[in-house]
Amino acid sequence: KAMHVAQPAVVLASSRGIASFVCEYASPGKATEVRVTVLRQADSQVTEVCAATYMMGNELTFLDDSICTGTSSGNQVNLTIQGLRAMDTGLYICKVELMYPPPYYLGIGNGTQIYVIDPEPCPDSD
């Protein structure tokens, strides 16, 4: 079954390569187990950047190798992606799955365009 997912259209990463955005889903029922996946759509590719499963009220547990962290509050997930560089600029899509209890619901956001600007190197000091 389909579910609405909202996320910001544009986010600018910090000078340290960190981007944060909120992914909000309109839960049709009382889900106790939720899976959130961040997809990057760019360069003619789709990449699962990170994924987390959490029980409502608990902290997010991300899969291996994750460059993401996050927290949940109700039907909102606050996601942070770290270690970004200019070449990582792209459309980051939030995918939410309500895993339990049935029925299964799937929602995919329209994506957040994350812009990353590499900082200028500091000039040498004499």
Partner: nanobody, 125 residues
Framework: EVQLVESGGGVVQTGGSLRLSCAAS????????MGWFRQAPGKDREFVAA????????AYADSVLGRFTISRDNANEMAYLQMNSLNPEDTAVYYC??????????????????WGQGTQVTVSS
């Protein structure tokens, strides 16, 4: 480096399926991000798919999304590429590759320092 050997290539009709396998040896397989690339005659090598070290995260080229599935079996040091709904544009030599790096946003650009010898896939119309 890890040694990689591909198998499973062959000739198949349009719309058919193949499953490519990549056997690894020599190093701890679970420390490597694994990728599949392909090279058609007269063209550059291109990214097909990649999978994270635990197998939980994946990436696909738009051209194969929904048709190809990458997977891995760390216990047996194997990587796989299930290819369905094949068409003549999929004809190429397919290479398995390993990158000793964690996951990120652009696995197609990882430094893959180990490559297999390739296996030929031919899709006839």
């Amino acid at each position: 480096e890890v040694q990689l050997v591909e198998s499973g290539g062959g000739v198949v009709q349009t719309g058919g399926s193949l499953r490519l396998s990549c056997a690894a040896s020599g190093r701890t397989f679970s420390m490597y991000t694994m990728g599949w690339f392909r090279q058609a005659p007269g063209k550059d090598r291109e990214f097909v798919a990649a999978i994270s070290r635990s197998g939980g995260l994946k990436a696909y080229a738009d051209s194969v999304l929904g048709r190809f599935t990458i997977s891995r079996d760390n216990a047996n040091e194997m990587a796989y590429l299930q290819m369905n709904s094949l068409n003549p544009e999929d004809t190429a030599v397919y290479y398995c590759a390993a990158a000793p790096v964690p996951w990120g946003t652009r696995p197609s650009h990882f430094t893959y320092d180990s490559w297999g010898q390739g296996t030929q896939v031919t899709v006839s119309s």
